[in-house]
């Protein structure tokens, strides 16, 4: 057994610039609290996975008003330690979760309202019995410098705290099978102690706080007798007689407590231990206060302190959920018109429009031909965001002021001659081609692919392109 | 300053029911949480059902099953239908509203539950 203690030295704005604002204000002043969750192991679990380790609330810190104008100070913190009492082995390998609190203290008729303003995760290694660890974490804007240690309660001693030592009965020696205790050689191993409430009759232990059954016992603190009943492989003594040992039925069997309460016996029926939030004989009673810190990503917590009471979370932008949980895919709802780009910063949605549409959602479209005028006689023609001139014959660009060339783009085939023309173009074909861009050949007997050419035209005259 | 006004409240035999109502109010947008608070003498004020600005609603274990919190943006309005009531339902009921930067109150509506 032991404790894991943690010391806040500073919350306040972490370097670099966006420096956050004031989480108090004069209108609503506040004062900050920091509860800690620890889990063995390096697991990677969620927030809202159990403390297995446990969890420790800190006392409220002072109340602190923002001076308008002062850029965020390092806020007041509580006083003293948070310590987190562990009853088995300190594992050596932990993962903790820190988080600061706002408690808003304006003119609330139904209490206070908590926030959570920041939360720090890390995974770490540490030995019981050793120095204090210091450590900075961020989270957003705001830092977080902090120690901790991990320390073994007497009689407990070692890195894992699974070592007893009791001080020595004789001046000179240890008692018979019990070692002197290093480092502290004046103290003795102490025999082991078995989980509180393990039979001594029927129950022993090799590592502390353990309870291993004799043949013939069973339940957690070995209590509860196994029934002899024939099965088809038989185990232990009584495989003479062709049965086995079934163990009986436990009060805590099928575990009677619901929402992860843990079952232990008791000498007449059960008792359930329930994790935060439940209660009720069989952990069945959800009560989920706001002093519990329900609400994630910033949600603010709105409810009494009575178990009975209700809470809801009222979210920031960006997330939903009971506990605002869940973050927002709120571009999935496609809320840019017209083609717009959408961009989802988490404070705020934006739209990024194509040319020529405007608004906070792309919905207006700009009047593309307003104020433009094609020249040479050409019409303004409007669409997809951008203004279009069609020109009149000999005209061309954006605005149908270059005059076309329009033999340019060489449309006669066949080695015709493109001239310009007032009305547009006229190619002149080469011998065996006939056609208004020479593109049909002549046949060798005079007839052509085409009806006859109109009289007055040979096949080989310059055809005019109307 | 802007308050909220609830009226529906009343004498009611066990068994019965009421529906109280909240606004109509501007003060009730779907951007802000809003709620029914209670408070019987001599206790604190407690939250018996709210709506979050998400749109998620939450009761107090006494209530479940036979209170149901509704909003009407259209309306501006909040709803507390309360059925099957008790004795122990007896209070004074208060509507609620808040976003992140201030908070509503109703000046409470007296509900009264006796035989």
């Known amino acids: 057994a032991g404790v894991f203690e943690l010391q806040i030295h500073s919350f306040g704005p972490g370097p670099g610039p966006g420096a956050p604002r004031s989480p108090c204000s004069a209108r609503l002043p506040c004062r900050l609290f920091f509860r800690v969750c620890l889990k063995p192991g390096l697991s990677e679990e969620a927030a809202e996975s159990p403390c297995a380790l446990g969890a420790a609330l800190s006392a409220r810190g002072p109340v602190y008003t923002e001076q308008p104008g002062a850029p965020a100070p390092d806020l007041p913190l509580p006083d003293g330690l948070l310590q987190v009492p562990f009853r088995d082995a300190w594992p050596g390998t932990f993962s903790f979760i820190i988080e600061t609190w706002r408690e808003e203290l304006g003119d609330q008729i139904g209490g206070p309202a908590w926030s959570l303003l920041a939360r720090v995760a890390g995974r770490r290694r540490l030995a019981a019995g050793g120095p204090w660890a210091r450590d900075i974490q961020r989270a957003g804007a705001w830092e977080l410098r902090f120690s901790y240690r991990a320390r073994c309660e007497p009689p407990a001693v070692g890195t894992a705290c699974t070592r007893l030592c009791r001080p020595r009965s004789a001046p000179s020696r240890c008692g018979p099978g019990l070692r002197p205790c290093a480092p502290l050689e004046d103290e003795c191993e102490a025999p082991l102690v078995c989980r509180a409430g393990c039979s001594p009759e029927h129950g022993f232990c090799e590592q502390p706080g353990e309870c291993r059954c004799l043949e013939g016992w069973t339940g957690p603190l070995c209590t509860v007798p196994v029934s002899t009943s024939s099965c088809l492989s038989p185990r232990g003594p009584s495989s003479a007689t062709t049965g086995c040992l079934v163990p009986g039925p436990g009060p805590c069997d099928g575990n009677p407590c619901a929402n992860g309460g843990s079952c232990s016996e008791t000498p007449r029926s059960f008792e359930c231990t329930c994790p935060r939030g439940f209660y009720g004989l069989r952990c069945e009673v959800s009560g989920v206060t706001c002093a519990d810190g329900p609400c994630f990503n910033g949600g603010l917590c709105v409810g009494g302190a009575d178990p009975d009471s209700a809470y809801i979370c009222h979210c920031p932008p960006g997330f939903q959920g009971s506990n605002c949980e869940k973050r927002v895919d709120r571009c999935s709802l496609q809320p840019c018109r017209n083609g717009g780009l959408c961009l989802d910063l988490g404070h705020a949605l934006r739209c990024r429009c194509r040319a020529g549409f405007a608004g906070p959602r792309c919905e207006h479209d700009l009047d593309d031909c307003a104020g433009r005028a094609c020249a040479n006689g050409g019409t303004c023609v409007e669409g997809g965001g951008a203004h279009r001139c069609s020109c009149a014959l000999g005209f061309g660009g954006r605005d149908c002021r270059e005059r076309a060339d329009p033999c340019a783009a060489r449309p006669c085939a066949h080695g015709g001659r493109c001239y310009a023309h007032f009305s547009g173009l006229v190619c002149a074909c080469a011998p065996g081609y006939m056609g208004a861009r020479c593109e049909f050949p002549v046949h060798p007997d005079g007839a052509s692919a085409l009806p006859a050419a109109p009289p007055g035209l040979r096949p080989g005259d310059p055809q005019r392109y109307l | 300053e802007v308050q909220l006004v609830e009226s529906g409240g009343g004498e009611v035999q066990p068994g019965g029911s009421l529906r109280l109502s909240c606004g109509p109010s501007e003060i009730i947008t779907s951007d802000k949480s809003v709620g029914w608070w209670r408070q019987a003498p001599g206790k604190q004020r407690n939250l018996v059902a709210g709506?979050?600005?998400?749109?998620?609603?939450n009761y107090a274990q006494s209530v479940k099953g036979r209170f149901t919190i509704s909003r009407d943006n259209a309306k501006n309005t909040v709803y507390l239908q309360m059925s099957s009531l008790r004795a122990e339902d007896t209070a004074v009921y208060y509507c609620?509203?808040?976003?992140?930067?201030?908070?509503?109150w109703g000046q409470g509506t007296l509900v009264t539950v006796k035989p």
């Open positions: 709506i979050s600005n998400v749109g998620s609603t």
């Open positions: 609620y509203a808040r976003d992140f930067e201030n908070e509503y």
